[in-house]
Interface confidence: low
């Protein structure tokens, strides 16, 4: 659901990751988009406690930029998804081991909540930076 609005990021969980004056997409399918999206990051972050130092900053960037997507203002505000290549870099390079564990836990139903699934992008469904350089966000 891409109904929402653009707003300057005023949260806390992604403060260290997003640009200071970042314009982010807030999804109005949530009653309180700012808090709901912050909670999504928080829930996913609890699962990321034990990741490696190599994976951690990449995972932070991916999480925050996926849940608080860059927003293209206009008559219809539009979220700009992360470029597929950056998503794949996190999945296959920086966090390969952790990503496998996460997928295994998901398949085996070991997560207490399915909320984290909303926090993890499906890389294959994201636009490539080679299609249209302005259609996706670079981490």
């Amino acid at each position: 659901d891409n109904k929402g609005y653009c707003a300057q990021y005023r949260g806390e969980v992604c403060n260290a990751v997003l640009a200071k004056d970042a314009l982010v997409f807030l999804n109005t399918s949530y009653a309180d988009p700012e808090e709901a999206q912050e909670l999504l990051v928080h829930t996913a972050w609890n699962e990321l406690k034990v990741v490696s130092p190599v994976c951690r900053p990449a995972a932070e960037a991916l999480l925050c930029n996926h849940i608080f997507q860059e927003c293209s203002p206009g008559v219809v505000p539009t979220p700009i998804p992360i470029c597929r290549e950056y998503c794949l870099a996190v999945k296959e390079l920086f966090c390969a081991k952790e990503w496998l564990v996460m997928e295994e836990k998901t398949h085996r139903g070991l997560y207490r909540s399915e909320m984290h699934l909303l926090s993890v992008p499906e890389c294959s469904k994201l636009p490539s930076m080679h299609w249209d350089p302005t259609a996706c966000a670079r981490l």
Epitope: E12, V13, D32, E35, E38, V41, H42, N46
Partner: antibody, heavy 120, light 108 residues
Framework: QVQLQESGPGLVKPSETLSLTCTVS????????WSWIRQPPGKGLEWIGY???????YYNPSLKSRVTISVDTSKNQFSLKLSSVTAADTAVYYC??????????????WGQGTLVTVSS | SYELTQPPSVSVSPGQTARITCSGD??????AYWYQQKPGQAPVLVIY???ERPSGIPERFSGSSSGTTVTLTISGVQAEDEADYYC???????????FGGGTKLTVL
């Protein structure tokens, strides 16, 4: 840089309500989380609760029934109310930035603290 | 209720290494934070996210994590490091904050 300053009465009678205000200067309260922490004389630290600038609150379960934290973004202040106080609530009360249960959940900076004594 | 356990006191000679531990069942899942508090002063953050050091904190302060225990290490302890040290973390479900009971570091 951001500075915090607690204010309020230093003496409260048993069974009454303790009220403190924290004024934030050098930055806007309209981001981050804002917390209250207390320290009884000669003892350790105890987290009381926090408020997000939007008004969402989380409280320590052990104090939840007596605590109210509110925010006034127009004054760049947030406040603590603790009801039905007893001598056990005598402590130095600190306000601090942070404590949001997310990526950046440390307390920094802190106010200098204000001693509140509960006595008749 | 969830608890973090610290030794009440640790003593070291100047120049030696001080290690202060903090134990809690949720520490494998939740980050730990360390604060230094000198008499009559507010606490100061010295380590965040288990092992990160804020700017302005001397390099002799470091943090590590192993299972249910996190450790604050002060290498080459100086007289000015004498203080109380508190660890902070969340319960396993991440709903409230807990502080350890504090450790008094004495520099002999």
């Amino acid at each position: 840089q951001v500075q915090l300053q607690e204010s309020g009465p230093g003496l409260v009678k048993p069974s009454e309500t303790l009220s403190l205000t924290c004024t934030v200067s050098g930055g806007s309260i309209s981001s981050y989380y804002w917390s209250w922490i207390r320290q009884p004389p000669g003892k350790g630290l105890e987290w009381i609760g926090y408020i997000y600038f939007s008004g969402r609150t989380y409280y320590n379960p052990s104090l939840k029934s007596r605590v109210t934290i509110s925010v006034d973004t127009s004054k760049n202040q947030f406040s603590l109310k603790l009801s039905s106080v007893t001598a056990a609530d005598t402590a130095v009360y600190y306000c601090a930035r942070g404590g949001g249960l997310g990526i950046s959940n440390w307390f920094d900076p802190w106010g200098q603290g204000t001693l509140v004594t509960v006595s008749s | 209720s969830y608890e973090l356990t610290q030794p009440p006191s640790v003593s070291v000679s100047p120049g030696q290494t001080a290690r202060i531990t903090c134990s809690g069942d949720a520490l494998p899942k939740q980050y730990a934070y360390w604060y230094q508090q000198k008499p009559g002063q507010a606490p100061v953050l010295v380590i965040y996210k288990d092992s990160e050091r804020p700017s302005g904190i001397p390099e002799r302060f470091s943090g590590s994590s192993s299972g249910t225990t996190v450790t604050l290490t002060i290498s080459g302890v100086q007289a000015e490091d004498e203080a109380d040290y508190y660890c902070q973390s969340a319960d396993s479900s991440g709903t409230y904050w807990v502080f350890g009971g504090g450790t008094k570091l004495t520099v002999l």
